[in-house]
């Protein structure tokens, strides 16, 4: 049988002679040269040659493991005399053993990584990886060990994994942000003679909130005119924070001071400044200086850094209110006055009052805005603000007069104010009641006595406090011997009733009834209205069939026989 094992050969042999591989040998070989060894298969006769007498195999060329890691060849042993094989043809392996001819190569020439500042020692930063093309199954040619060439004492690298970690406590981004670390990967397990490669790792410390905001000055002073409307910015304050991004975001607030309710502070998100604004209307005459305590704080706190102290700072803000020449101020925002409609001209209705709010207390004069009183019904005393009538009033024409009064500083006519004045005209009983409509009714010739032929209604332009109370009666001159009667219903209506049985339209076709309507107010007002009654022929249902169109009217306005 064949006597061999697998053969091994070092790659990239550099000697001048052929490289010895091994020996083929059959136990049938008696050493007398009777056997002939034949080699075939991968690279036979080219890469590999055999001494046909001894079975010694040599490699004729420099081999490279990465071209083919294994060569499979066939061996034959033949009896020279008979030409017959003394062993079955068999295969064997020549395995090319790797020499360390490949340096470790990092997967990236430059790595970029970040780690939070102030991180604990041993915090993971990044893992670097180097690969080696040599055979990992043979020797240490591909066994890579990592070490740090540059970047100590700040960082360390795990020799087997390539994991870079922080190595120094309290690395402060605000002190130094960028680090360049050089890592070496060396094969042969890092031993002498190993091949190496390097990579650069650019490490940036990312920000954590380890710095509080700080005001660069303890006191700020701003001025603002008292006329500044709410929302007006007065000034800007800015606390500085050595951190960046959201860790440098600042919220401002007013924590104390006399003007806590008079001012606001808002944060400008772009500049991180605190903008002090007016919250309520200021008044120089009431308060001229405000002192506030403004606080700047970080909204995003990291609890582990609270031991460094409060993440806030405060400053004093002094606000000086500047005097502004202000227009006069009326004692009320509006005035409501009343006057009877029968008031005589020059009757005083009431008065308005305005005062200069400034410390100077400039005198004021009053006037009526004539655009609001075109008919010049009212006037005002320019000195004391008394309002009086300059024309007669009529409630029934206009119930309310809405006028505007102007107060102007005498020394500075540009400073003026206006106030609305609502004047209500009170009712006086100066109108008589009247019929609500023109009444023309009819009566059937065959009408019975006490029949209701018409209901009367009255109207009155006046508006008495207790409501209208009208009374109805026939005029005295028509009351006696009238063919009709008036029945006062005591509800501001009255009925006309027949007074006899039957009417003859041929005798009298039309009656004119004078009715007196009186009100119940003081002084009593009354009027006389006329009701026309026509006598008509009716059917047995009382439906009118024919009437005379006209009546005979006497100069007195009373019809004959009324």
């Amino acid at each position: 049988s064949w006597m061999w094992n697998q053969f091994f050969l070092l790659e990239e042999y550099t000697g001048s002679d052929y490289q010895y591989v091994g020996k083929l040998h059959s136990d049938q070989d008696r050493g007398d040269g009777s056997l002939k060894y034949i080699l075939s298969g991968d690279g036979a006769g080219d890469l590999f040659i055999i001494n046909e007498n001894t079975g010694d195999i040599q490699a004729t060329k420099r081999l490279d493991r990465e071209e083919k890691p294994v060569y499979i060849l066939r061996a034959q042993a033949i009896n020279r005399r008979t030409g017959r094989p003394v062993e079955p043809e068999s295969e064997f392996i020549i395995k090319i053993h790797d020499i360390n001819d490949n340096e470790p190569i990092f997967t990236k020439d430059v790595y970029t990584a970040t780690v939070p500042e102030m991180a604990d020692v041993g915090t993971f930063v990044v893992q670097v990886t180097a690969t080696d093309a040599d055979d990992p199954t043979y020797g240490n040619s591909a066994k890579v060990v990592y070490s740090i060439l540059q970047g100590q004492p700040y960082f360390s690298v795990e020799s087997e994994t390539g994991i870079i970690k922080t190595a120094l406590l309290n690395m402060d981004r605000e002190n130094r942000e960028q680090y360049q670390v050089v890592i070496q990967a060396k094969d042969m397990g890092g031993q002498m003679g190993g091949l190496s490669g390097t990579t650069t790792v650019n490490i940036t410390l990312t920000d954590v909130n380890d710095n509080p905001p700080r005001f660069p000055q303890s006191t700020y002073q701003f001025k603002t005119p008292e006329s500044s409307p709410p929302g007006t910015p007065i000034g800007r304050i800015k606390a500085s924070d050595a951190d960046v991004g959201e860790n440098a975001e600042i919220e401002y607030s007013i924590t104390d001071g006399e003007g806590h309710d008079m001012f606001d502070v808002i944060t400008d998100q772009e500049t991180q400044e605190g903008i002090i604004t007016v919250k309520k209307l200021l008044d120089f005459e009431k308060k001229r200086v405000y002192t506030l305590k403004v606080e700047a704080s970080n909204p995003h706190i990291e609890p582990r850094f609270l031991y460094l102290g409060p993440f806030k700072d405060s400053a004093t803000v002094r606000i000086v209110v500047d005097d502004v020449d202000e227009p006069p101020v009326f004692s009320k925002p509006a005035y409501i006055l009343q006057i009877r409609e029968d008031a005589q001209i020059n009757t005083t209705i009431g008065s308005v009052a305005a005062q200069d709010p400034d410390a100077a207390r400039n005198p004021v004069k009053y006037s009526v805005d004539r655009h609001t009183d075109m008919d010049r019904i009212f006037n005002i005393d320019s000195g004391n603000g008394s309002i009086f009538t300059s024309k007669l009033l009529d409630r029934e024409t206009l119930l309310w007069h809405n006028i505007t009064v102007i107060a102007t500083e005498i020394n500075n006519p540009k400073q003026s104010s206006r106030v609305p004045l609502y004047i209500k005209v009170l009712d006086v009983n100066d109108n008589a009641p009247e019929f609500a409509e023109f009444y023309e009714t009819f009566v059937c010739e065959k009408a019975k006595a006490d029949q209701l032929i018409q209901t009367l209604h009255a109207v009155d332009k006046d508006d008495p406090y207790s409501g209208h109370q009208f009374s109805f009666s026939l005029a005295p001159e028509a009351a006696s011997g009238s063919n009709f009667t008036i029945q006062d219903n005591k509800d501001n209506t009255a009925g006309i009733l027949t007074r006899k049985n039957g009417y003859n339209r041929h005798e009298m076709s039309t009656y004119l009834l004078p009715v007196v309507i009186s009100d119940n107010d003081y002084p009593v007002q009354s009027s006389t209205g006329t009701v026309t009654v026509r006598v008509c022929a009716c059917d047995h249902h009382g439906n009118m069939q024919s009437c005379h169109a006209e009546a005979l009217i006497h100069p007195t306005g009373l019809s004959t026989g009324a």
Epitope: K68, P69, S90, N102, A133
Partner: antibody
Framework: QVQLLESGGGLVQPGGSLRLSCAAS????????MHWVRQAPGKGLEWVSF????????YYADSVKGRFTISRDNSKNTLYLQMNSLRAEDTAVYYC?????????????WGQGTLVTVSS | DIELTQPPSVSVSPGQTASITCSGD??????VHWYQQKPGQAPVLVIY???NRPSGIPERFSGSNSGNTATLTISGTQAEDEADYYC??????????FGGGTKLTVLG
């Protein structure tokens, strides 16, 4: 001329078995190492298995190890691939290819391929 | 173990030069072979041992291998060169590795 011709492909259920053959002609079959390579539909080439010229040495891709067996019968100039415990992911065209020392141990030539479909 | 990476596709105008890359760590230390596969056909060896042409392969096909990249170059590309191209090398022991393949499109 040098020729390789695969056969034995077809439809088989998951868990089933199939035996592929590759008939060689035009060269001394027993002098060459042989390989099986497969190609899933619309995908790239994937090496499957190797056998040395006399069949003493075999080698397999991890994806088929323990399920597939490569063998050869030099007297019949035929290469085989016995496929057991087939899975849906084994669906592919299977090529046999000759390893040619003269071409730096590259594959030349290749057979036309046989389609194996694993589906229920 | 080596891993071979190819671009999924490359486009070229007729007559222009097409370059298809195959990258892997220290690939220069490995022998690379290239195969051409047209639709419905078996692969064909076009370059062996980095830069050698088998008989019958046109001269416009050439190869190179250095650093981390092996390259198949087709100068004066023709319409019939439109195909999928695969690089291949030996991995550990007796295993073989292929690149993912590159589809070459000849425009026009």
């Amino acid at each position: 001329q040098v020729q390789l011709l695969e056969s034995g492909g077809g439809l088989v259920q998951p868990g089933g078995s199939l035996r592929l053959s590759c008939a060689a002609s035009g060269f001394t079959f027993s002098s060459y190492a042989m390989h099986w390579v497969r190609q899933a539909p619309g995908k790239g080439l994937e090496w499957v298995s190797f056998i040395s010229s006399l069949g003493s040495y075999t080698y397999y891709a991890d994806s088929v190890k323990g399920r597939f067996t490569i063998s050869r019968d030099n007297s019949k100039n035929t290469l085989y691939l016995q496929m057991n415990s087939l899975r849906a992911e084994d669906t592919a065209v299977y090529y046999c290819a000759r390893e040619t020392a003269g071409y730096g141990y590259a594959f030349d030539p290749w057979g036309q391929g046989t389609l194996v479909t694993v589906s229920s | 173990d080596i891993e071979l990476t190819q671009p999924p596709s490359v486009s070229v105008s007729p007559g222009q030069t097409a370059s298809i890359t195959c990258s892997g760590d220290n690939i220069r230390k490995y022998v690379v072979h290239w195969y051409q596969q047209k639709p419905g056909q078996a692969p064909v060896l076009v370059i062996y041992r980095d830069n050698n042409r088998p008989s019958g392969i046109p001269e416009r096909f050439s190869g190179s291998n250095s650093g981390n990249t092996a390259t198949l170059t087709i100068s004066g590309t023709q319409a019939e060169d439109e195909a999928d191209y695969y690089c291949q090398s030996w991995d550990s022991f007796l295993a073989v590795v292929f690149g993912g393949g590159t589809k070459l499109t000849v425009l026009g």
